[in-house]
């Protein structure tokens, strides 16, 4: 997250983290149900773990945290690498969630966010694109939803329904490290970090996020039937 | 199948400008999950990374030559460029251009598809 | 910069043997940002391994990376008669440099 701020302690307790090997963040995800993530489905990788409940970078234990395996991870149908549409993945986790203050699914949003609707992206990702600086806690950062047309001015031809362009003035933006995190609008799950420019925080290159809203039914159709 | 070639002029004085051209085939530049770089080796030496173009046009220099270099796209021919001036024999070398992937995950992916490399000689 | 030194300079081993190349970083490096390069004579370098342990797509599995920090190794198994060849370490944690390379020759 580039020119955000440190996320207040458990204020984001659906983020999660997934790890290569020991403790290597290379995604965020997001807690949807007591035993299901989402992420973007260009966060991939056979073998990973989750964190869950934990507010700083480093692997220190934290006592909120829980840690998972994934046992399935199901990327959207309509998914191909390396294009962005429909990039979002289920990850299904070995067990289920012991509920707590730290840790705690969010609700989906059934309706599209609108142009101008404030929301919070949130992730472990750099805090400066060119040279890489990773902080120390999660870091929070509004962001506004922008109108589809800005979004397509901003990347032509590369604009579908799956996603949406959210940011603000020049210096904000999600980053590298980001990717699969939420983008949460009044209280709900609206998007996750997907795509966008590089470096990050350009001017009229916004961040392009998994446009959730139009998911919803494939997502709970995938859960139930596994 | 992705493939890229390098062109340009074998032999280049030493002050004059270095004028290479990579010609991307099988795929399109215009992409938001790749970028394109140029990397150079030296007769019998290591490689060096010169620098990188994203899909805006925005461009990533290696400090070392960053007031010597400029790299540029052609999306209509889908081409990229690469322009090195005041060039010395130390500017000798083997140059090659390259595609890497890049995304908002954490992840470098490295460059996986390489051109064949074209030989540039600085002499008078 | 962040400089990367390879070492040993030059393996001499025999085919069917395990090599063990080493790439030390002058600062620490986040593993997710380094990469392994193979060169044969006269050919570009092929990628390997990214993210310090990830096979590259067709990279055959006796080929693995490891490492954290400031050190980091690219193992190959059992060398076949084709992996003879030089290997190039890279760092893009920072401005992207490569290590002087190690050359894997027959013995």
């Known amino acids: 997250i580039v020119n955000g701020s440190d996320c207040q302690k458990d204020a984001q307790p659906w983020q999660g983290a997934l790890l290569l090997g020991p403790n290597k963040l290379y995604c965020g995800a997001v807690l949807i149900s007591p035993q299901w993530l989402l992420t973007a489905a260009h966060c991939r990788k056979p073998v990973f773990r989750i964190r869950l409940g934990h507010h700083s970078m480093s692997p220190v234990y934290e006592s909120g945290q829980q840690m998972f395996q994934g046992i399935k991870s199901i990327p959207h149908p309509g998914y191909s690498h390396p294009g962005h549409s429909n990039d979002l993945m289920l990850i299904k986790m070995n067990r289920k969630i012991r509920d707590s203050h730290s840790v705690k699914p969010v609700e989906i949003a059934c309706d599209c966010a609108t142009e101008g609707t404030r929301c919070m992206v949130s992730g472990w990702g750099t805090t400066s694109s060119s040279h890489n600086n990773f902080p120390k806690v999660l870091q929070c950062l509004n962001i506004t939803v922008l109108s589809e047309e800005r979004c397509k001015n901003s990347y032509p031809g590369q604009i579908d329904k799956t996603m949406f362009c959210a940011g603000d003035e020049e210096g904000r933006d999600s980053c590298q490290g980001d990717s699969g995190g939420p983008v949460v609008c009044n209280g709900k799950l609206q998007g996750l970090v997907s795509w966008g420019d590089f470096p990050c925080a350009q001017r009229n290159r916004p961040g392009v996020y998994t446009n959730l809203c139009e998911f919803v039914k494939w997502i709970k159709d995938t859960m139930n039937s596994n | 199948q992705l493939q890229l070639q390098e062109s340009g002029p074998g032999l280049v004085k030493p002050s004059e400008t270095l004028s290479l051209t990579c010609t991307v085939s099988?795929?399109?530049?215009?992409?938001?999950?790749?970028?394109w770089a140029w990397i150079r080796q030296p007769p019998g030496k290591g490689l060096e990374w010169i620098g990188n173009?994203?899909?805006?046009?925005?461009?990533y220099y290696n400090p070392s030559l960053k007031s010597r270099v400029t790299i540029s796209v052609d999306t209509s021919k889908n081409q990229f460029s690469l322009k090195l001036s005041s060039v010395t024999a130390a500017d000798t070398a083997v140059y090659y251009c390259?595609?890497?992937?890049?995304?908002?995950?954490?992840?470098?992916?490295?460059?996986?598809?390489w051109g064949q490399g074209t030989t540039v000689t600085v002499s008078s | 910069e962040i400089v990367l030194t390879q070492s040993p300079g030059t393996l001499s081993l025999s085919p069917g043997e395990r090599a063990t190349l080493s790439c030390r970083a002058s600062?620490?490096?986040?593993?997710?940002?380094l990469a392994w390069y193979q060169q044969k004579p006269g050919q570009a370098p092929r990628l390997l391994i990214y993210?310090?342990?990830s096979r590259a797509t067709g990279i055959p599995d006796r080929f693995s990376g490891s490492g954290s920090g400031t050190d980091f190794t690219l193992t190959i198994s059992r060398l076949e008669p084709e992996d003879f060849a030089v290997y190039y370490c890279q760092q893009a944690f920072s401005s992207p440099t490569f290590g002087g390379g190690t050359k894997v020759e027959i013995k």
């Open positions: 600062q620490s490096v986040s593993s997710s940002y």
């Open positions: 993210g310090a342990s």
């Open positions: 099988g795929g399109s530049i215009p992409s938001s999950s790749y970028y």
């Open positions: 390259a595609r890497g992937e890049y995304d908002r995950s954490a992840l470098y992916y490295g460059m996986d598809v």
């Open positions: 173009i994203y899909y805006s046009g925005s461009t």
